[in-house]
């Protein structure tokens, strides 16, 4: 038997993926657990195997179809259950009626690249992945730049309030190594949250031209 409190949190990526994390305070022995998705108005259902991500939490991804297919809408309600094997039967450990478009978390932006770099500035572009056509261009982004001797947490956040898949970083130091990350969020959804940060993009500014002797 499992005692203690549990937390079951899921997000929809707006296309064909629901990612879930289940946390359980009480110790679980070598138990097999899964998440089962049962939509109220679709002919499919889906299951994924929960895999440990820490001592007391497990995660899995429900793949609902091809990555860019629109599998759910605002009127869908998906019953999500955590099921754990107990002997020959499955026990329901957690359950929620999931409204996908109230719980959005998009995929991290991809394909970050340096478009142009100078001594004091750098132009960077990226792409969004698997975002619903419903949003059209109405997305917001946050970006941050890691400077030498600082941590990501110390980096100031730059906010882009529109679907602008590029940024021009200015006031950079010449001949310096930087890293850059970006994340995305739609406007819709009461419990919607930012995407994970993108993979960091490393770049180096150009050295300053040698000044003339005075």
């Amino acid at each position: 038997a499992v005692n203690g409190t549990s937390q079951f949190t899921c997000f929809y990526n707006s296309r064909a993926n629901i990612s879930c994390v289940w946390s359980q305070d009480g110790a679980l022995q070598d138990t097999s657990c899964q998440v089962h998705a049962w939509p109220d108005r679709r002919r499919w259902n889906q299951t994924c195997e929960l895999l440990p991500v820490s001592q007391a939490s497990w995660a899995c991804n429900l793949i609902l179809g091809a990555p860019d297919s629109q599998k759910l809408t605002t009127v869908d309600i998906v019953t999500l259950r955590v099921l754990c094997r107990e002997g020959v039967r499955w026990r329901v450990m957690a359950i929620q009626d999931f409204k996908p478009f109230e719980n959005l978390r998009l995929m991290a932006p991809i394909s970050l690249q340096v478009v142009h770099v100078e001594t004091h500035r750098c132009n960077i572009s990226w792409e969004i992945s698997q975002a619903s056509h419903y949003f059209e261009r109405h997305l917001e982004f946050e970006a941050r730049t890691l400077s030498p001797g600082h941590t990501w947490e110390e980096a100031p956040l730059l906010t882009l309030k529109q679907k602008q898949e590029w940024i021009c970083l200015e006031t950079l130091t010449p001949d310096t190594q930087y890293e850059f990350q970006v994340r995305v969020k739609p406007l819709q959804g009461e419990f919607t949250t930012w995407s994970p940060w993108s993979q960091p993009l490393a770049f180096r500014t150009k050295p300053a031209a040698l000044g003339k002797d005075t």
Epitope: R42, Q70, T73, D76, E136, H138, P186
Partner: nanobody, 119 residues
Framework: QVQLVESGGGLVQTGGSLRLSCAVS????????MGWYRQVPGKQRELVAD???????KYADSVKGRFSILRDSAKNTVYLQMSSLKPEDTGIYYC?????????????WGQGTQVTVSS
């Protein structure tokens, strides 16, 4: 400004048929669901049928096998084919559209069309 225009209501005898239609027009939008709701005096508006993207239709138990919903996404129009009508189908039928406008989703309603089934 978004507009929903319903048509096709009227008076029909028990066992008869009607076809309701509802067209959405106005500012730039994307529709992800369209449907029909019914209201009778003293009761709350209730779902009759709706259809979401992906062809997923939902019907009230009381109309299953008698009503069918059809959605023409290209024309932003939804139809409700009603057959084997009964007196208890009488009411005001409202069209509802779930629309994405500027990255946010909202529900929009038509003015309603009266359906009366006489015995």
């Amino acid at each position: 400004q978004v507009q929903l225009v319903e048509s096709g209501g009227g008076l029909v005898q028990t066992g008869g048929s009607l076809r309701l239609s509802c067209a959405v027009s106005g500012s730039r939008f994307i529709s992800d669901v369209m449907g029909w709701y019914r209201q009778v005096p003293g009761k709350q508006r209730e779902l009759v049928a709706d259809m979401a993207d992906g062809g997923s239709a939902k019907y009230a138990d009381s109309v299953k096998g008698r009503f069918s919903i059809l959605r023409d996404s290209a024309k932003n129009t939804v139809y409700l084919q009603m057959s084997s009508l009964k007196p208890e189908d009488t009411g005001i039928y409202y069209c509802k559209a779930g629309l994405w406008i500027a990255g946010r989703h909202s529900d929009y309603w038509g003015q309603g069309t009266q359906v009366t089934v006489s015995s």
